[in-house]
């Protein structure tokens, strides 16, 4: 058993709020069985670590947020993985039961003689985790005894089903936001005919079945679905490609619901074949506007649109964060350990001092070199704030006129706090109203990020648009320069005057062949030629028939 | 069908342009490669248009050769031609809009280099 | 980058044998092949593409096979108008390659 995984940050407070985020990286294979994790993370992990400690900060000096009431937290590490977080929030679990049994006076000593030790506050209500399948796990754990899970980032659409998942709340909006946000862009543009991927597991599955329901709804038409791991590889990649290329000239268009390493796998594999710049890339947020994705591959990867959770950088956040330093950082027991991943350094005479360094840490080391904010920051803030929110109203609705946590609020029921965290209304951390649907989710705000040459072997992700709560917005000019160079994903041009749509057996309705009607007839509908009846003969327009005019033979006239 | 045109004796250092005329292909949805065969040797790649217009060469070429297309023609421009040159040069039809296989042929143009 | 390398250069068969031409690509090509027959003064023709799909119009006597970097070229029950050069091509990148064409194998009916 690997003892990072015990490591836990405290802050002690009235009410205890429970976070795991993904301090290391999930084990590799053939360390899954054991449980150990990988390297420590940055934004994923030590970010949203001090972001917990200092939100809280921030809100316990808040007068006007649960005033006479301190908020602690108990931080654990889920390291990207089911069986890890599980297993930490178990132990969570296990403080609630302890202190459950503490109040009715339950606990003993081994010996039978009653026990003087106070045991940890429980956990009121959990944080995170980042990862919807990790999320989905560790709901079904908590959920059984009444805890409140607010994640940051899981974004899967089965998490709305309040049936199954009814204690798991988001300040971030379900998959099928984005699905329906991709499925605007393509009918924005007249893209009638495009090719699918996915990535294999829950994010890029559910995703890919709303988008393909979605496009259905609307007449677009999907020429093929495929779908490929995260980390499979090169070959797979590679057939995938030519797949995509069997359909081209007509599906230009490739929407991929996919994680970033899987579009970096396309990318990749365009380099090998030979295929940059014949497809355009429509991502999800798995792409976002990451630069891990394109790096090296940028000529690939122009022109892609991808859909980007809506979330500025929080500056309070970066003041607070950057001043950091292992000397006086002593809350965040993880901090050395990153210190000396980030610096490549040892830091001598520390408890935590890595002998794999050679370098010894120098004191002018800062943070604000290379600094990057974690893109989920706004969201891991409201997430800690909707929880603070939400006891902040249950205060004033058990405990009216009282300052404080009043008897009836203690010990505090999950049911009651659930209740009142789905009624939250605040203005997050960036301006913009937090609250949440009867499923437990939040409304859907992205951005539309462009790929682009900004100048010779200069590429840089530009925002071109926006999609609010249904309502897409798009420059057009930004990303086309001009009309004519949209790009066509389409399977059969429009039918001429006096033609009709005959669509091959087996295949889509959007790929058909145009046959004219015959000399007697007119178009009936897109699909249908009828003949006009006898003494009657095809409009112009051929739209309809029209009455031939009675013309009476006389003996004097010429042969016609 | 696919025919090659424009192949004559030439020096060294003169250019020279190949034409490849197409009739019953629509030049937007299939690809179409060059491929050269000098005197007794085997089939040799120069390079493909795709259907949306891009251009792929043989690591070889290094810039001697550009392919460009009409909407009914395919052109392959020789850059400052050498004895090695010499060979009968090849339009064909690719399977689909970008490399694969090249499933219709034209009949082939020669090009002798010589001086 | 994916260099096709074709044995043998030259084959010998007697009407009615069999003949087996091998191909190898520098790395896998994913099935990703052609075979054409080539006769003198004409242009070459199509026989099997993806390893193994016969071209239409191409006897069934010639049979394509392999995966990954083998791949075998198999013509049973040979006929004199059999005679002619056999190129295998791989169909799957145009990117930094050399010769996409094997190096041709030569048959002769007897």
């Known amino acids: 058993q690997s003892s990072e995984r015990r490591v836990v940050a405290h802050m002690p407070g009235d009410i205890i709020i429970g976070a795991l985020f993904s301090v290391h990286h999930q084990p590799t294979v053939d360390k899954v069985h054991e449980r150990k994790c990988g390297a420590v993370r940055e934004q994923y992990g030590i970010q949203r670590v001090e972001a917990m400690l200092h939100t809280l900060e921030r809100i316990n000096s808040d007068p006007t947020l649960l005033p006479n009431i301190t908020l602690g937290c108990e931080i654990r590490d889920s390291c990207w993985h089911s069986a890890v977080a599980l297993e930490q929030s178990i132990e969570f679990i296990r403080d609630s039961l302890i202190s459950s049994e503490e109040e009715e006076g339950l606990v003993r000593c081994v010996d039978g003689s009653s026990s003087s030790f106070r045991s940890k506050k429980p956990i009121v209500g959990v944080i995170g985790p980042g990862s919807s399948s990790v999320a989905i796990q560790v709901q079904n754990l908590l959920q059984l005894f009444n805890i409140p899970q607010i994640a940051y980032s899981a974004t899967s659409m089965d998490l709305s089903d309040k049936t199954l998942f009814k204690y798991f709340m988001r300040v971030v909006p379900s998959d099928a936001q984005q699905a329906r946000a991709m499925v605007d862009i393509v009918k924005r543009y007249n893209w009638t005919y495009v090719s699918a991927v996915h990535t294999e597991g829950n994010y890029g599955e559910s995703g890919m079945e709303a988008f393909k329901d979605m496009s259905a709804k609307e007449g677009i038409c999907i020429a093929h679905s495929y779908k490929i791991y995260s980390n499979a590889g090169e070959q797979s990649f590679d057939k995938l490609l030519k797949k995509l290329t069997s359909h081209l000239p007509k599906a230009r268009v490739v929407a991929c619901f996919c994680e970033g390493m899987t579009v970096r796998g396309l990318l990749m594999a365009m380099r090998r074949l030979g295929l940059a710049g014949e497809f355009l890339l429509l991502g999800s947020d798995g792409w976002a506007d990451r630069y891990d994705v394109t790096d090296g591959y940028q000529r690939e990867a122009v022109g892609g649109i991808t859909i980007k959770l809506q979330s500025p950088d929080v500056k309070w956040f970066d003041d607070y964060y950057l001043k950091l330093r292992p000397e006086t950082n002593h809350r965040n027991p993880w901090f050395q350990e990153f210190w000396q991943h980030r610096f490549q350094c040892r830091l001598e005479g520390f408890p935590q001092e890595n002998s794999k360094y050679n370098k010894t840490c120098n004191s002018s080391l800062t943070l604000k070199t290379h600094h990057v904010q974690d893109s989920k920051m706004g969201f891991v803030i409201n997430a800690i704030y909707s929880m603070a929110y939400g006891l902040h109203n249950m205060q004033m609705s058990l405990c009216p006129g009282y300052a404080g946590l009043c008897d009836a609020m203690k010990p505090i029921d999950g049911r009651k706090l659930l209740e009142s965290l789905m009624k939250t209304n605040f203005t997050g951390v960036s301006g913009d109203t937090i609250l949440f649907d009867e499923n437990g989710d939040s409304p859907g705000r992205y951005e539309i990020m462009n790929f682009k040459e900004m100048g010779k072997d200069y590429f840089d992700y530009i925002n071109v648009g926006s999609w609010d709560n249904g309502e897409l917005k798009m420059d057009d000019d930004e990303v086309w320069s001009k009309k004519s160079n949209i790009i066509r994903s389409v399977c059969s041009e429009p039918c001429e005057k006096g033609q009709i749509k005959v669509i091959r057996k087996g295949e889509v309705s959007c790929c058909w062949t145009c046959t004219p009607c015959k000399e007697n007839e007119y178009v009936f509908d897109e699909y249908t030629c009828k003949a006009c009846q006898l003494g009657s003969w095809p409009t112009d327009d051929l739209t309809g028939c029209d009455l031939i005019p009675v013309q009476y033979l006389r003996w004097g006239d010429p042969e016609p | 069908s696919l025919e090659e045109s424009g192949g004559r004796l030439v020096t060294p250092g003169t250019p020279l342009t190949l034409t490849c005329t197409v009739s019953g292909i629509d030049l937007s949805s299939y690809a179409v490669g060059w491929v050269r065969q000098a005197p007794g040797k085997g089939l040799e790649y120069i390079g493909i248009i795709y259907a949306s217009g891009n251009t792929w060469y043989a690591s070889w070429v290094k810039g001697r050769f550009t392919i460009s297309k009409t909407s009914t023609t395919v052109d392959l421009k020789l850059a400052s031609l050498t004895t090695e040159d010499t060979a009968t040069y090849f339009c064909?039809?690719?399977?689909?809009?970008?490399?694969?296989?090249?499933?219709?042929w034209g009949p082939g143009t020669l090009v002798t280099v010589s001086s | 980058a994916y260099d096709m390398t074709q044995t043998p250069a030259s084959v010998e068969v007697a009407v009615g044998g069999t003949v087996t031409i091998k191909c190898q690509a520098s790395?896998?090509?994913?099935?990703?092949l052609a075979w054409y027959q080539q006769k003198p003064g004409q242009p070459p023709k199509l026989l099997i593409y993806?390893?193994?799909d016969l071209a239409s119009g191409v006897p069934s006597r010639f049979k394509g096979s392999g995966s990954g970097t083998e791949y075998t070229l198999t013509i049973s029950g040979v006929q004199c108008d059999d005679a002619a050069t056999y190129y295998c091509?791989?169909?799957?990148?145009?990117?930094?390659?050399?010769?996409?064409f094997g190096g041709g194998t030569e048959v002769v009916v007897k």
């Open positions: 064909a039809r690719g399977h689909g809009a970008t490399y694969d296989y090249f499933n219709l």
């Open positions: 993806d390893a193994s």
């Open positions: 790395q896998s090509i994913s099935s990703y």
């Open positions: 091509q791989q169909g799957l990148a145009t990117a930094n390659v050399d010769n996409v």
